[in-house]
Amino acid sequence: MAVTACQGLGFVVSLIGIAGIIAATCMDQWSTQDLYNNPVTAVFNYQGLWRSCVRESSGFTECRGYFTLLGLPAMLQAVRALMIVGIVLGAIGLLVSIFALKCIRIGSMEDSAKANMTLTSGIMFIVSGLCAIAGVSVFANMLVTNFWMSTANMYTGMGGMVQTVQTRYTFGAALFVGWVAGGLTLIGGVMMCIACRGLAPEETNYKAVSYHASGHSVAYKPGGFKASTGFGSNTKNKKIYDGGARTEDEVQSYPSKHDYV
């Protein structure tokens, strides 16, 4: 039960995280015009990974795509790449994890296969989350560097008389969305990996071993089996679990040791 809950929760958290990574990647507000300690302008500039926008005081917004590929800064290209890799890995991870979910029955899929798929999707989510966090952090670092550079040259004099105000950019909403989304995807991935451990079948063969004591006959069984005395009518060894008792005879495959938590 706990395994299913952990896996399901991991899936949902990752799903929200990946949706957030996609949203952040598409958002235009990766960097926004810094309004603090800056001459107040009647236009507001903000930039995304794919286009830059200008909003006039009337609300009129004009966005222009970055139609060049070679002319863009290498850092921006790197951030784009990291975010796309994160989305692709996350999407594949989601696809894999759907089939790995314990609550979904697909043919006669073995628990070991589900465990492997859960682990695979978990790792994919972790890498996806790390890619998003890395991408957003690289962009944030780029902003911080540019911010202080533009602060140092905020007013570039022209003949000592005319001043040109350099627009400074600060963190946009997309950065925070990206950090949170990356974190959620990472957490979801970790949860999937934890769930995988619970799904993985134990290799130990649960065979009964009898130890004959000097008194009356008592069979001790390893692995959580209840000791049964030879006096009562209970002649079969029963394993205790949440869903009721199942006799050893009825067990066809070796159950996972966490299957009955």
Partner: antibody, heavy 120, light 113 residues
Framework: QVQLQQSGAELARPGASVKMSCKAS????????IHWLKQGPGQGLEWIGY????????NYNQKFKYKATLTADKSSSTAYIQLSSLTSDDSAVYYC?????????????WGQGTSVTVSS | DIVMTQSPSSQTVTAGEKVTLSCRSS????????????LTWYQQKPGQPPKLLIY???TRESGVPDRFTGSGSGTYFTFTISSVQAEDLAVYYC?????????FGAGTKLELK
């Protein structure tokens, strides 16, 4: 067609207050900001401030911060400017103007102006 | 506040003549985000409110005759009337539409010779 109809001329005593109106028609009033400008006799234009009727957000020129108060009534599609503690320096023609959409923050339609004379 | 300096303060012209008015701003009105200059030109005839002619330094308002053109970038702008007509006699104002508070030049008065 778009029209901004301003109230009639005002004659006021020094220290008094006046409230002028600017009734908009021919467009959706809350969608466009209304700017107010002052033009002294034989002088240039001075920007007082603007109001966004939709949000009631106002932005004032610091010079007029304590002189002018901008308000708007969406139900009657009317913008108002109140000038307080009048002095002879406030004698001027006051214009209301609509900020155009996608016009580089320019004012595309203007009222005919309201003349304010401050005299004892 | 941004200071807008217009020159000349007045100019005497004859019908059909080409006229160029200039406007300087104390700070650049060029927005890097869209590479547009937030400078506006208005025409004001006696007893009338100003009329929008040019915005974004060079974009003509709809209905404005094509003899009116605006140009320039950053801090220096010009306004040209290719062939002055009698109805063009008015005061022309340039306006900073980039920084608050919006500021206007003192105006250039066009008079008939």
């Amino acid at each position: 067609q778009v029209q901004l109809q301003q109230s009639g001329a005002e004659l006021a005593r020094p220290g008094a207050s006046v409230k002028m109106s600017c009734k908009a028609s021919g467009y959706t009033f809350p969608t466009y900001s209304i700017h107010w400008l002052k033009q002294g006799p034989g002088q240039g234009l001075e920007w007082i401030g603007y109001i966004n009727p939709s949000t009631i957000y106002t932005n004032y020129n610091q010079k007029f911060k304590y002189k002018a108060t901008l308000t708007a009534d969406k139900s009657s599609s009317t913008a108002y400017i109140q000038l307080s503690s009048l002095t002879s320096d406030d004698s001027a023609v006051y214009y209301c103007a609509r900020e155009g959409y996608g016009r580089g923050n320019a004012m595309d339609y203007w009222g005919q102006g309201t003349s304010v004379t401050v005299s004892s | 506040d941004i200071v807008m300096t217009q020159s000349p303060s007045s100019q005497t012209v004859t019908a059909g003549e080409k006229v160029t008015l200039s406007c300087r701003s104390s700070q650049s009105l060029l927005n890097g985000g869209n590479q547009k200059n937030y400078l506006t030109w208005y025409q004001q005839k006696p007893g009338q409110p100003p009329k929008l002619l040019i915005y974004w330094a060079s974009t003509r308002e709809s209905g404005v005759p094509d003899r009116f053109t605006g140009s320039g970038s950053g801090t220096y702008f010009t306004f040209t009337i290719s062939s002055v007509q009698a109805e063009d006699l008015a005061v022309y104002y340039c306006q900073n539409a980039y920084f608050y508070p919006f500021t206007f030049g003192a105006g250039t008065k066009l008079e008939l010779k």
